[in-house]
């Protein structure tokens, strides 16, 4: 499939101009290669009318130009003084016309309306409101006022001052007669339909002295805004329908066959199953505007989207709408990463999150998608040293491996951790990705004691048993804190006896704390990694108490206390609503507020990512 994208249809009127934008992946080769606009010939081929290398056909001389915008991967063709001869099938493309790096565009130039003299033209968007003003003279002030629509050769009454309303306009039309000072009456039509377009005649009086005024109503279907996003990336649809529908239910739908528009999400709580875990509808502003964020873009997400307002929460005739044509570029700059990561209860997952490598200094985040109402994504961790209180000791965001990827590790998994998580940064909003964590049957691979108590001034040895499957991995112990997990020295104690059917390659690696102090209290992780890529981890909480009896403590698996369940939500809890997710520039303000609240919270971490493969939780 060609990665070039543009408008499928362009409609205009004789004498007018059009501006056609075509999108291409902004690789260095594409940025510098020839751009062209060609017309498809009746006998094959596509004949260049204008190109970026200076060619302008005689047909276009003096009325067209082509401008390349390499920095954002677009080029624009402007054509002026359109005639009906310009109607036809075109392509915009890159390179050589016959090579297929192009997009088909249909240009339709229609004749301008043949209007009667003194005709007032009203041009209004579909679903909006029009007010047709009708002046009259004093002698007709007390006479019947009416509005007719020309249907073929005959005028058909639409509304009049005696109370008649044509059934096609019921519930959406009114006739207002201004105060005595103004010789004017108005007809207001709401929820305009395409079928309302046409020639109207308003009239005051019914005899030969009546006052008449012609009006031409043009109802415009909104031209879709072109949106070009990368596979696996993110898109935001900003929908501003105006304050008059501020209190009406809003929706985003995707056009399927014909005129059908399947609801993707609406403010009445409906959400299409295909978008579970990867969509947020941001709360409306007072003016009725709202936005919808979709992450983890798939090929099948491409198409025409409409946002609108209607009490049913779905598209109906007369809904005010905005339109987008979404193209999903399969030559994506966003790398593949797992869309599903599996872990076992008590075990861990390590999730890789991609980010735009040009933004290595950006703040990284990880949030948990919640589907209630319109969806939201409260933050769990960031790269600035903040971790949500109940995730202390079991969640860490690491800048490794770097160069476009960061890692999030979550351990002590429970069934409540199953769900969708988003990776994001305060930089490029297109690089939001989604991953689903699934909790499956099984036992954790790493075996550690539960809670451990150390004695002040003594030595503590904590074991971690690694099965033979991790023989080629680097094994480590580290102390968790809000900025990550600081590596500690550990000892290889030889083969472990903790595994059945496991040979000499299993390992027991111990952490030794000499002369324990109060500062040693906290969470410790043992884990495996290969270079900068992290695998499974297991966590142990070490408590420190006063000396009771002399000697060192060597903790075994059998003596371990039960691990504590999740901590309850405390006052340090922080959540950034979807508004911040939708516009990460808001993070800075939210963070400043949060920092003052969360100083007791002392924890730091990060965000998660997605693609088309699945990844197990135990290793990479």
């Amino acid at each position: 499939k060609s990665p070039i994208f543009g408008p499928e249809e362009v409609n205009s009127v004789e004498g007018n101009s059009v501006s056609i934008t075509c999108y291409y992946p902004p690789t260095s080769v594409n940025r510098h290669t020839r751009k062209y606009w060609c017309r498809q010939g009746a006998r094959g081929g596509c004949i260049t009318l204008i190109s970026s290398e200076g060619y302008v056909s005689s047909k276009y001389a003096g009325r067209a130009n082509l401008t390349n915008f390499p920095e954002n991967g677009t080029f624009v063709v402007n054509i002026a003084q359109l005639s009906q001869d310009d109607s036809g099938r075109y392509k915009c493309g890159l390179g050589i016309n016959s090579r297929g790096l192009s997009f088909d565009v249909s240009l339709e130039v229609s004749q301008g309306p043949g209007l009667l003299n003194d005709t007032k033209v009203y041009t209004v968007d579909l679903g909006r409101t029009v007010t047709i003003n009708c002046p009259f003279k004093t002698e007709n002030a007390q006479k019947r006022k009416s509005l007719y629509k020309q249907i073929g050769l005959y005028p058909v009454l639409v509304i009049d001052s005696s109370g008649y309303v044509n059934p096609n306009y019921t519930g959406r039309i009114r006739l207002d007669i201004q105060g005595t000072g103004q010789l004017l009456f108005s007809v207001v039509i709401n929820q305009l339909r395409l079928s309302d377009a046409g020639q109207y005649l308003c009239q005051a009086g019914d005899d030969s002295n009546s006052n008449k005024k012609n009006a031409d109503l043009q109802v415009l279907k909104p031209e879709p805004e072109l949106v070009y996003e990368d596979l696996r990336g993110s898109v935001t649809f900003h929908c501003a329908l105006g304050p008059e529908v501020a209190n009406v239910a809003k929706f985003l739908c995707r056009q399927s066959s014909g005129e059908n528009c399947d609801v993707v999400v609406n403010t009445l709580g409906k959400r299409a199953p295909a978008f579970e875990g990867r969509i947020l509808l941001n709360p409306q502003d007072k003016d009725g505007s709202f936005s919808v964020v979709i992450t983890g873009l798939r090929k099948e997400d491409a198409g025409r989207y409409l946002c609108g307002a209607h009490s049913d929460g779905q598209l109906q005739e007369g809904s005010p709408i905005q339109a987008w044509q979404l193209f999903v570029n399969e030559e994506s700059t966003i790398p593949r990463s797992p869309t599903v990561v599996k872990g076992v209860a008590g075990g861990s997952v390590a999730v890789l999150c991609p980010y735009n490598r040009k933004e290595s200094k950006s703040i990284k985040y990880w949030c948990l998608w919640e589907g209630a109402q319109n969806g939201r994504c409260p933050l769990l961790v960031d790269s600035e040293g903040w971790v949500k209180a109940q995730y202390e000791g079991r969640l860490s965001l690491l800048e490794e491996p770097g160069n476009g990827t960061f890692t999030v590790i979550l351990n002590q998994l429970t069934s409540r951790d199953a769900g969708f998580y988003w990776c994001l940064t305060n930089g490029d909003t297109l690089w939001r990705t989604t991953v689903e964590i699934k909790i499956i049957e099984g036992e954790p691979n790493l075996k550690v004691p539960g809670n451990v108590t150390a004695v002040l001034g003594e030595t503590l040895k904590v074991p971690c048993h690694f099965p033979c499957k991790f023989s080629s991995y680097e094994k480590y112990w580290c102390k968790w804190n809000n900025t990550g997990c600081q590596a500690l020295p550990s000892q290889d104690e030889g083969p472990s006896k903790a595994f059945v059917n496991c040979d000499e390659n299993s390992r027991l690696v111990s952490l030794t704390l000499n002369l324990v102090t109060r500062a040693d209290e906290g969470w410790y992780w043992c884990g495996v990694k290969q270079g900068h890529f992290y695998g499974e981890t297991a966590a142990v909480y070490v408590a420190v108490e006063e000396r009771k009896a002399a000697g060192s403590r060597d903790v075994s698996l059998a003596k371990a206390d039960a691990a504590p369940d999740e901590k309850v939500l405390d006052s340090g809890f922080r959540e950034i609503e979807n508004k911040a997710i939708q516009d990460p520039r808001l993070f800075a303000e939210e963070k400043a507020v949060a920092d003052t609240r969360d100083q007791a919270d002392g924890s730091r971490a990060s965000v998660d990512s997605g693609s088309s493969e699945e990844q197990g939780g135990s290793s990479r």
Partner: nanobody, 129 residues
């Protein structure tokens, strides 16, 4: 093998005439629009003339209008460029090339060189006293 061969070039004095021929082998020219191009030393290749296969219409660059005439003889599978009143600035290598059957008409002139598929090897025309 599909081939275009130009001939008829040479040295001529200003005001003189030459007739260039473009003979096709391996395919018939009557389906294609044919263009003549030229390239002077150190300059870009430029379109000179184009003849349409669909309606026989002909198109010329402003610099040669009224002096050059393009014609075709489908029976001989050849296209000609008659060049009169030659000027020193007409000195160049002249090439003929084929394009889609309605290209000249679509652009109402000489199509972009990128739209031409098969090209001849060129014939040198030198106008000098």
């Amino acid at each position: 093998e599909v081939q275009l061969v130009e001939s008829g070039g040479g040295l001529v004095q200003p005001g003189g005439s030459l007739r260039l021929s473009c003979a096709a082998s391996g395919f018939t020219l009557d389906y294609y629009d044919i263009g003549w191009f030229r390239q002077a030393p150190g300059k870009e290749r430029e379109g000179v003339s184009c003849t349409s296969s669909s309606d026989g219409s002909t198109y010329y660059a402003d610099s040669v209008k009224g002096r050059f005439t393009i014609s075709r003889d489908n029976a001989k599978n050849t296209v000609y460029l008659q060049m009169n009143s030659l000027k020193p600035e007409d000195t160049a290598v002249y090439y003929c090339a084929t394009t889609f059957g309605d290209a000249c008409t679509v652009v109402a002139g000489i199509p972009d060189q990128y739209d031409f598929g098969s090209w001849g090897q060129g014939t040198q025309v030198t106008v000098s006293s």
